[in-house]
Amino acid sequence: VPRWRQQWSGPGTTKRFPETVLARCVKYTEIHPEMRHVDCQSVWDAFKGAFISKHPCNITEEDYQPLMKLGTQTVPCNKILLWSRIKDLAHQFTQVQRDMFTLEDTLLGYLADDLTWCGEFNTSKINYQSCPDWRKDCSNNPVSVFWKTVSRRFAEAACDVVHVMLNGSRSKIFDKNSTFGSVEVHNLQPEKVQTLEAWVIHGGREDSRDLCQDPTIKELESIISKRNIQFSCKNIYRPDKFLQCVKNPEDSSCTSEI
């Protein structure tokens, strides 16, 4: 008789999940020689231990602590780039501006980027059929708790001027319900962080509006100011030119506004 299996509303675990996590870990240590001390098998074991045999709606930050410990990494605290709903451009930026880091440029972020995973209570099986959806099923699922945990730690580590890239094409440029809005903003440390600088990325070629005046940006400014952190905002009217100028800052066309 086939065993009854819980059907969740979200997609199941990414295929080849164990192989992918292990391969990504080894790749990361190959790319970052300063992380060669990391034992990738232990990292996978700790990752697995956080969700295997546990109810996928009952995951806690505590479950991820062994993984957090193994993935401890020092990034320059004044070179942190946060992002919300504009991941690809943020990653293109740090690929060019090598001294800046998004969460996905750290080991733990790199391991889990774009992956889904969950297990089942009381069995060692990984669920490849379905996993809990944050809205429809539960918020304390393995993926959401992971990102909440690593995002909190990343924001807590930040200092001096912290940058955030925001998507100016969305109806809510700053969304209180995003990971940035619900976790990172509230975990920046006022005693370490002097300024949060928002870069609002424009989508349309002819869009010359000052999106820094958007009501949601004003809301972000209010939240940040109440936390005794200064706020500044810049419009990035031409993201393609912006990236090109990061690559070639001496280009004559890069003195004008981008």
């Epitope: 192989e19 391969a23 790749k27 020689p33």
Partner: antibody, heavy 120, light 107 residues
Framework: QMQLVQSGAEVKKTGSSVKVSCKAS????????MHWVRQAPGQALEWMGW????????DYAQKFQDRVTITADRSMSTAYMELSSLRSEDTAMYYC?????????????WGQGTLVTVSS | DIQLTQSPSFLSASVGDRVTITCRAS??????LAWYQQKPGKAPKLLIY???SLADGVPSRFSGSGSGTEFTLTISSLQPEDFATYYC?????????FGQGTKLEIK
């Protein structure tokens, strides 16, 4: 079995560009970093750069920074190395190579090499 | 960049001889060193990784030792197929670098 098969020999004019391909088979292409190494006639090996085929992220040796572009096509399991503004000193055998994850970070697997000849 | 200096550059030996090739690094590279064998017209072949670990399929007459800045490749009893050029490579830091090579010839 694991194989890296490179494109054929090329003869190029000074100032032009060359694009060498490296088709991977027998393993999951995105699971490994791909490196490019060159060797001028009678000379030592010289590391040029790497690509993470999963994300397209790259890093290049300073010497080649302005002239080399490494790319990857995941759907074709193929990595490419393009070298521009060719000069006679770029005449060399170009290799793609990768580690085995079980052999430290030494290059356990190599393509057969692609000879690029630059003539004026 | 880390410089690797191999010595000797040329080495003449006979079948059955024991030969040693040295590789010196300009700074501490721990055990992050590989040795390769290359024959004319062929791609290099990995012999040793992590300074002293034998790669799969490599005969046990090859061995590596050392750590830090001084490394050696030893072939305990030369076979006819061992005459080739040998390179050391460091992968402690980018850019990865190679030694200038040691050409092993038949005496």
């Amino acid at each position: 079995q694991m194989q890296l098969v490179q494109s054929g020999a090329e003869v190029k004019k000074t100032g032009s560009s060359v694009k060498v391909s490296c088709k991977a088979s027998g393993y999951t292409f995105t699971d490994y970093i791909m490196h490019w190494v060159r060797q001028a006639p009678g000379q030592a090996l010289e590391w040029m750069g790497w690509i993470d085929p999963e994300y397209g992220r790259t890093d290049y040796a300073q010497k080649f920074q302005d002239r080399v572009t490494i790319t990857a096509d995941r759907s074709m399991s193929t990595a490419y190395m393009e070298l521009s503004s060719l000069r006679s000193e770029d005449t060399a055998m170009y290799y793609c190579a990768r580690s085995a994850h079980t052999t430290g970070f030494g290059f356990a697997y190599w393509g057969q090499g692609t000879l690029v000849t630059v003539s004026s | 960049d880390i410089q690797l200096t191999q010595s000797p550059s040329f080495l003449s030996a006979s079948v059955g001889d024991r030969v040693t090739i040295t590789c010196r690094a300009s700074e501490d590279i721990y055990s992050n060193l590989a040795w390769y064998q290359q024959k004319p017209g062929k791609a290099p072949k990995l012999l040793i990784y992590d300074a002293n670990s034998l790669a799969d399929g490599v005969p046990s007459r090859f061995s590596g030792s050392g750590s830090g800045t001084e490394f050696t490749l030893t072939i305990s009893s030369l076979q006819p197929e061992d005459f080739a050029t040998y390179y050391c490579q460091q992968y402690n830091n980018y850019p990865y670098t190679f030694g200038q090579g040691t050409k092993l010839e038949i005496k």
